[in-house]
């Protein structure tokens, strides 16, 4: 048995006569042989579920579900209840109605075995019938909505009449009907005004019925029509077995460059026309088990269940359904030497499904784990300016497919052919498993015998110690020119183009800072600034070389304060700035200010 609504509403007036009928509550059957029996909770409740008083005023007919006044609710009774309402004005009280067979404790009131009946209290007597508007004569203030379980025996779930109005205003004639399309499973009995289902409903065919209730009021010669929505929601039960969309029960996958723990290797989709169990229960009741195979597979893979609600078309309307994605996921980082092929089976069980048929499916994953060989190009050739400053980025080294790697930890090292010409350093970038080559020793750059720098690049997989090697030849170009006196260590200090371009700074490949002219569009990512190399700084990312010294690119790397119009970077630096941004790394400060219209040079010329 279950209630067709979880809440009912009616009005209560002071001194309403004992015996006044208030409303009917309705229960629907889960099985044909069930007979409902109603009982009221012992207490009346007020605002914020405050228990006000034992219910001495309202009774229920156990077999019919009719609620009526057992005794009149006078002013003194009302005040007694109001005092207990934690100081709030008492505008609404509610009662709990239980279906007798269910032994729910008074404290809990959960649909389907319990419903709440709310009474709006009016501190006046019942109004004169002639003063009631048609809307008040026809329907309660709060529009009802109904819930009916699918596949259950048909039954009565609503009664249209407002019983106090019918009781106190017998001369007003009120008629009801349901507007509904052809073939809908509802009927409104013209005599009793009871609404019932004609047959058991199937949610997978239709989930929502947006009916309209029409009320016609006859008062003397006057006839008025009132229409209100009459929504019915069909509640789901687990009556559909899981299936494979388009019959696809097998997924094949190759694990090669993406070897990181939590990588999704393959996905298989299961469709279920049901939307139960509900999300809270779903993973517990809709189980997936990786069937025992070899231990390696059990340790290496796991299956993740990702249910999602979807909607499908049925008989011209959309109904909800569930798609279950079963993802085969790496449980650990896989070594580059792993080389296996296996078939994994996953048992999916819709444990609430009662049949006919089985609620069990078998998913198949064919997985090939390929080994990864580390290869470097045979030779790298680069050039570097003799004027390059320390931390200038001059190139990248990268094992074959390194951009595609994840879960593979490759470290790069440089072996210089001689210590006196050991100019470059290499750091491994976590983002793309490449090695960034940078100037580490500017003194060596200036030695005449170091016109050509010979290195061996050694790439080592940290897990297996497998290596790849390549020769790196760096040609040193240009001649060294000493820097202007008084230039700052960081390019970012310069606020104007002129002073920017006549100095060098840490990270500058040419020995000169570069000016980046912004687009001038308010707070923008493309703000004006002075940089060691606009290729790498600022780019919204504090790279592995820039982390070596805050003076290289404070625009990307500063953790200090930024003054002026800006958007901070995540987790550091300036994501966007207003006008020109310059920085003072030692003070851990950056300033973003409107561009100066006049250059000092212009001032001189104007004089």
């Amino acid at each position: 048995l279950y209630f067709s609504r979880d809440a009912y509403w009616e009005k209560l007036y002071v001194d309403q006569a004992a015996g006044t009928p208030l409303l009917y509550v309705h229960a629907l059957r889960d099985a044909p042989e069930e007979v409902p029996s109603f009982r009221l909770g012992q207490h009346l409740y007020g605002t914020y579920r405050t228990r006000l008083h034992e219910n001495n005023w309202i009774c229920i007919q156990e077999d019919t579900g009719l609620l009526y006044l057992n005794r009149s609710l006078d002013h003194s009774s009302w005040e007694k209840l109001s005092v207990r309402n934690r100081g709030f004005p008492l505008l609404t009280v509610y009662l709990k109605v239980f279906l007798s067979p269910t032994s729910l404790r008074e404290g809990e009131c959960q649909w389907p075995g319990c419903a709440r009946v709310y009474f709006s209290f009016f501190n006046t007597s019942f109004p004169a019938c002639s003063s009631l508007k048609p809307r008040e004569l026809c329907f309660p203030e709060t529009r009802p909505s109904f819930r009916i379980r699918e596949n259950r025996p048909p039954g009565t779930f609503h009664q249209f009449r407002l019983l106090p109005v019918q009781f106190l205003c017998p001369n007003i004639s009120v008629a009801y009907r349901l507007l509904e399309g052809e073939g809908l499973p509802f009927r409104c009995a013209p005599d009793s005004l009871e609404v019932s289902t004609r047959w058991a409903l199937d949610r997978e065919q239709r989930e929502k019925y947006e009916l309209v209730a029409v009320c016609t009021v006859h008062a003397g010669a006057r006839e008025e029509v009132v229409m209100v929505p009459f929504p019915v929601t069909v509640y789901d039960e687990d009556d559909s077995a899981p299936t494979f969309p388009a019959g696809v029960d097998t997924a094949s996958a190759v694990v090669e460059f993406k070897r990181k723990e939590d990588t999704v290797v393959a996905t298989l989709r299961v469709f279920d026309a049901d939307v139960v169990p509900a999300s809270g229960e779903l993973v517990r009741r809709y189980t997936s088990t990786l069937l025992p195979g070899d231990t390696w597979a059990q340790q290496t893979f796991r299956v993740e269940h990702w249910p999602n609600e979807t909607s499908v078309q049925a008989n011209g309307s959309f109904v909800r359904a569930t798609v279950h994605d079963y993802r085969l996921v790496l449980n650990r980082n896989l070594s580059i030497s792993e080389n296996r092929t296996m078939q994994l089976a996953v048992l999916v069980n819709d444990s609430d499904f009662q049949g006919p048929g089985a609620g069990v499916l078998l998913l198949h994953f064919n997985v090939s784990v390929l080994p990864v060989s580390l290869h470097l190009p045979s030779t790298y050739s680069l050039s570097v300016s003799r004027r390059a400053r320390r931390f200038a980025q001059i190139g990248k080294v990268c094992v074959e497919n390194c951009q595609a790697f994840s879960g593979i930890n490759v470290q790069y090292k440089l072996h210089s052919s001689g210590a006196n010409c050991s100019t470059l350093g290499v750091v491994t970038s976590a983002e793309d498993t490449s090695g960034i080559l940078f100037v580490n020793d500017t003194k060596a750059l200036r030695r005449p015998k170091c016109a050509e720098l010979h290195y061996m690049v050694v790439a080592t997989d940290q897990q297996t110690s497998r290596q790849a090697q390549a020769q790196l030849l760096v040609t040193v170009e240009g001649s060294y020119v000493a820097e202007e006196a008084g230039c700052p260590l960081s390019c970012a200090v310069s606020k104007r183009r002129l002073e920017c371009e006549e100095c060098g700074g840490l990270g500058s490949p040419t020995g000169r800072c570069e000016w980046r002219q912004g687009d001038g569009k308010g707070i923008t990512r493309n703000f004006s600034t002075c940089s060691p190399s606009t290729k790498t700084c600022p780019d919204g990312h504090c790279d592995v070389v820039e982390t070596q010294d805050i003076n290289i690119c404070p625009q990307d790397c500063l953790r200090g304060s930024i003054v002026g119009g800006h958007e901070p970077g995540e987790p550091r630096g300036i994501k966007a700035g207003y006008g020109t941004c310059n920085c003072f790394p030692e003070e851990e400060k950056c300033f973003c200010e409107p561009e100066d219209i006049q250059d000092p040079l212009c001032d001189e010329l104007c004089r």
Partner: antibody, heavy 118, light 107 residues
Framework: EVQLVESGPGLVKPSETLSLTCTVS?????????WNWIRQPPGKGLEWIGY???????SYNPSLKSRVTISRDTSKNQFSLKLSSVTAADTAVYYC???????????WGQGTLVTVSS | DIQMTQSPSSLSASVGDRVTITCRAS??????LAWYQQKPGKANKLLIS???TLQSGVPSRFSGSGSGTDFTLTISSLQPEDFATYYC?????????FGQGTKVEIK
Amino acid sequence: EVQLVESGPGLVKPSETLSLTCTVSGYSITSDYVWNWIRQPPGKGLEWIGYIHYSGGTSYNPSLKSRVTISRDTSKNQFSLKLSSVTAADTAVYYCARGNYDWAFAYWGQGTLVTVSS
Amino acid sequence: DIQMTQSPSSLSASVGDRVTITCRASKSISKYLAWYQQKPGKANKLLISSGSTLQSGVPSRFSGSGSGTDFTLTISSLQPEDFATYYCQQHNEYPWTFGQGTKVEIK
């Protein structure tokens, strides 16, 4: 003047490990350059085996990599070669040599003949 | 690996002759080729590196030329002490590889 002298057993049994040492005088192996092992089978050409860098890093010829280990003893200014699971094909004169700034081999030892035979 | 092919494998010449040995690489090695002299009972000697750079202490009668794949060692006037085996070696690409040698004998 840099001098390199190879030493080690002249006869090694098949499947055993060949071990040679190169003693360097006149230059510290931790100061600079790469320190190499090269071999020459009787009547054949030269084959580079691998090196140990002044920093301690190593690099090996891929064709021998699975069997080779080059290490050093800085206190004695020596570097060593170990070649495991030897066969008759590993019979050769083994040279140690110092690399140049362009990877060419500027200084060589006299070489030592190692015969693999039971 | 880069294959190095020397020719001829041996040659006979007289003192004072001009001798040319060629070395061909299986792919371009830029200018990075070294030449060595090997004599029995003596340590091998680096003559030329980077194609044409004469090492200190090496007589000027030795010269190297070429780039890409084709290289030449020339001894302008053969001396008695030059009778030996000569090897080329590419030092452009890992792993470094040698030619099979050219033996220069007395005619």
